[in-house]
Every structure is written in C-alpha cells, then in structure tokens.
C-alpha cells in the first residue's frame, strides 16, 4: 500500500503519500477553528508509470497508452485513496462544540 | 457534472471528460481482443482550482493550500468518477467468448 | 538518524558563482523538505529558500535573482547555487530540515560551512 | 517581511536564574513561532515550536508563552550548558524570518 509506512521510509519518485501539515488560520484563513491548531493533512503526488498501483482498468490502460504516446498527456494521475476523518474543537457563541469533518486526512495513496 | 454533455461542449481548461480512442494493437499493443478494433475511453484533465469540482473535504482543503503554495504541488488531481465496461470479443482457441471488462470507459470526472 | 552535512569552497571571489552541497541520511528527499539558512558572523540568521519534497522551490524575495535550489533525490543531496557573490555574502551557511513539510520550523541542522568572500 | 524584535541582545545571570527572553512580531503570527539555543560554532538546536510545544529532549526548564504580539521564552532555573545566544522565529510567513538573538552569559 502507498501509505505512510511505506513511503515515509523510501525514496520513492512515484505516487506516494508525502506529509502535509497544514495550519488552519495560516494557509487556508479558517480562524474559526479552536482545536487543533492544524494537523497533518497529507497529500499524494508522484508519477503514475505502468501498474503502478493502478486503481482500475482504466487507469491500467491509460498508463499503458501513456507510455506509447506521452505528448498526449493523457496518463493516470496520482490521488488519495483511504481518509479518515479529523476532530475539531469550534465555538457557537460561547458553546463548545466538538464535530468529527469526514475526509480530512490523507491515509494512502493510488494512480487513477 | 464533468461529462461529456458538459465537457465536450465547453472549452474548459479545469477538470474535465477529454475524449481518447483506444486501439488495442496499436495503441497497447493488444493482439488477443478480435472485436472490438479499439473503443472510446476518455480521460480526465485539466486544472483543479478551489472548489471546482472538489471529491472530499480532503481535496476541498488541498486546492485552498495550493493557491497560497503552489511550489508545494499538493493541487487536487482530476481523475476518473464514473466508468463504465467493455463488452468484448476474444478466442481461447477456435471458441470465441464475449467478456464484460469493467471500468474500461470514463463517464465523468472529479478533483480529488 | 538524521543527518545533514554541507560542503562546498570556503573562500569565494566576488562577483563568483558558489555552489554548496547537503548531503542528507536517515530520511528521504521526497518525503521532507530541506531549507537553506545562513548566518553571517557574529550577525542573525536569514532563511535563503527551500526545495519541496515534490521537487518544487520557495525563495526569499531578497535572494531571488541569485538563488536555485535543486536536489538529486537518489544521491540524497540538496544543492544550493548562489551568483553573484559580494563580501557581505561572507557567511556559516546551514541546510536545515523541518520536522513535517510546511511546518516551517527546523528540527534537524547540518553543522554549518563558513564561505568567505573576499579577492 | 514579518519583522521580529528580540530583547534584550544581551542578558547577564546566574545559575539558579529565572530568564525571560522577549519577542516582538510586527503582525499577527498566530502562534507560529520557534525558539533556538545556539552555542559558538555550532548550529542552532530547537527549543521550542508552535510557541509553548516542547521539542523533543529538550529540559522541561524551558517553556514558552504568549501575549498578543509578544511571545516569551522562560527558563525557570539556568543551568551552566544554558549559557548560549536564543533566536526566536517567526513560521507563519514567507520568508520565514529570525530575531537579532539574545546572549545569555555568565553573571
């Protein structure tokens, strides 16, 4: 799997999973975000050669093709595959509110 | 949506359904399929600006970031939604058989 | 363990191109980002630029114009390319990690290389 | 640029000392700041990051805080291999910027 484990520990110029922190006031401006301050959000990015990870046939095909006609730009694009969600700390007024934003982080990574 | 009714009648340079035909042979160098000669598979390219198209939170967050870095190269990727299969004819022998291959045809795309 | 380690001249002419290397272990180029910072004698430190794990650049706007930073990811080594060198470039310059890419603090330094620009 | 104002540029104390080190930022920098010791020859060690998160290994004696634009940096009892020039750092904005270092030294 394209995921922390493996490409945490590799160099790998291919779709991987690469960290990410990513602060919420400073680069995406949601000051209404108590907790936490930011998280490590991840990304997937790298080449998609042929069979790397392929996520369909299609993706399979595509790369094939790419590899053939290249110019086309036409190849699988590297894309995250497994998230899990991220609990956040807000205020409504005076209230607390804790809630679980699904799809937050980044878990592994696939060519689509 | 990002499909062929949308995307092949706009000139849009965000993600969007691009089509692509496939010849087996020549372009995949594929022998074995006898019918058909090649199909119509499509792909998904084009930018992914903040909110254009976004899968997840994840990619919703991603595209934000990317505006504000975008030498980071964490940009959401436009990649295949909906795909469809292939109905295809192939021979073991002389007995022909007709084969569904899934996911062989892009319907529409998304950022994610 | 993590180590950086620049090399490159110590002595520099004006007006010469320098050209300094960081050589990293126990971490891949393509998972964390390397930042060039230098401090010139007795004086603060100043961030020069960075290279992204994606391979992407980030300078400081007062060094734009003569700065490239470049990597070579299955040596694992950074290089910085500085033109146009003045006797005030007279520096220890430091490549530098940060703990999570965008976190943007530095968790792990070379030992540092004092460049002298001098005739 | 985020100009960062470091004081005082030098400070006189003994061991046993509380020290504090001040740093002013010239915006908000919503708690994006790190603090390093450096020692002569040797390149700068992180204390401090995210102004109050204690970097790993790094003595409990140290501790960060903020006030508004001004962030702190506390050593509550100087110990002798705390003798040492502190640098605070500004990690919110390109380019990330330094202040002119503080110089702890011997009473």
């Known amino acids: 799997a394209l995921d922390a484990a493996y490409c945490f520990r590799n160099v790998q110029d291919n779709c991987c999973l690469r960290p990410l922190y990513i602060d919420f006031k400073r680069d995406l401006g949601w000051k209404w975000i108590h907790e936490p301050k930011g998280y490590n959000a991840n990304f997937c990015a790298g080449a998609c050669p042929y069979l790397w990870s392929s996520d369909t046939q299609h993706s399979r095909v595509l790369s094939l093709y790419n590899t053939i006609n290249p110019e086309a730009s036409a190849s699988p694009c590297c894309v995250s595959q497994d998230l899990e969600p991220l609990t956040i700390l807000y205020y409504i007024g005076k209230t607390p509110k804790i809630e679980q934003l699904s799809n937050m982080i980044v878990k592994s990574c696939k060519c689509s | 949506a990002l499909d062929a009714a949308y995307c092949f009648r706009n000139v849009q340079d965000n993600c969007c359904l691009r089509p692509l035909y496939i010849d087996f042979k020549r372009d995949l160098g594929w022998k074995w399929i006898h019918e058909p000669k090649g199909y119509n598979a499509n792909f998904c390219a084009g930018a992914c600006p903040y909110l254009w198209s976004s899968d997840t939170q994840h990619s919703r967050v991603l595209s934000l970031y990317n505006t504000i870095n975008p030498e980071a190269s964490a940009s959401p990727c436009c990649v295949s939604q909906d795909l469809e299969p292939l109905t295809i004819l192939y021979y073991i022998g002389k007995t022909p058989k007709i084969e569904q291959l899934s996911n062989m045809i892009v319907k529409s795309c998304k950022c994610s | 363990e993590v180590t950086l380690k620049e090399s490159g001249p110590v002595l520099v002419k004006p007006t010469e191109t320098l050209t300094l290397t960081c050589t990293v272990s126990g971490f891949s180029l393509t998972t964390y980002n390397v930042h060039w910072v230098r401090q010139p004698p007795g004086k603060a430190l100043e961030w020069m630029g960075l290279i992204w794990n994606t391979g992407g650049t980030r300078y400081n706007s007062a060094l734009k114009s003569r700065l490239t930073i470049s990597k070579d990811t299955s040596k694992s080594q950074v290089v910085l390319t500085m033109t146009n060198m003045d006797p005030v470039d007279t520096a220890t310059y430091y490549c530098?990690?940060?703990?999570?890419?965008?976190?943007?603090?530095?968790?792990?330094w070379g030992p540092g290389t004092l460049v002298t620009v001098s005739s | 640029d985020i100009q960062m104002t470091q004081s005082p540029s030098t400070l006189s104390a003994s061991v046993g000392d509380r020290v504090t080190i001040t740093c002013l930022a010239s915006?908000?920098?919503?708690?994006?700041l790190a603090w390093y010791q450096q020692k002569p020859g040797k390149s700068p060690k992180l204390l401090i990051y995210d102004a109050r998160s204690l970097q790993d290994g790094v003595p409990s004696r140290f501790s960060g805080s903020e006030s508004g634009p001004e962030y702190t940096l506390t050593i509550s009892s100087l110990q002798p291999d705390d003798f040492a020039t502190y640098f605070c750092?500004?990690?919110?904005?390109?380019?990330?910027?330094f202040g002119q270092g503080t110089k702890v030294e011997i009473k």
């Open positions: 915006e908000d920098i919503y708690s994006n």
């Open positions: 530098a990690r940060d703990p999570v890419p965008n976190k943007w603090h530095f968790d792990f």
């Open positions: 750092q500004q990690h919110h904005a390109y380019p990330f910027t």
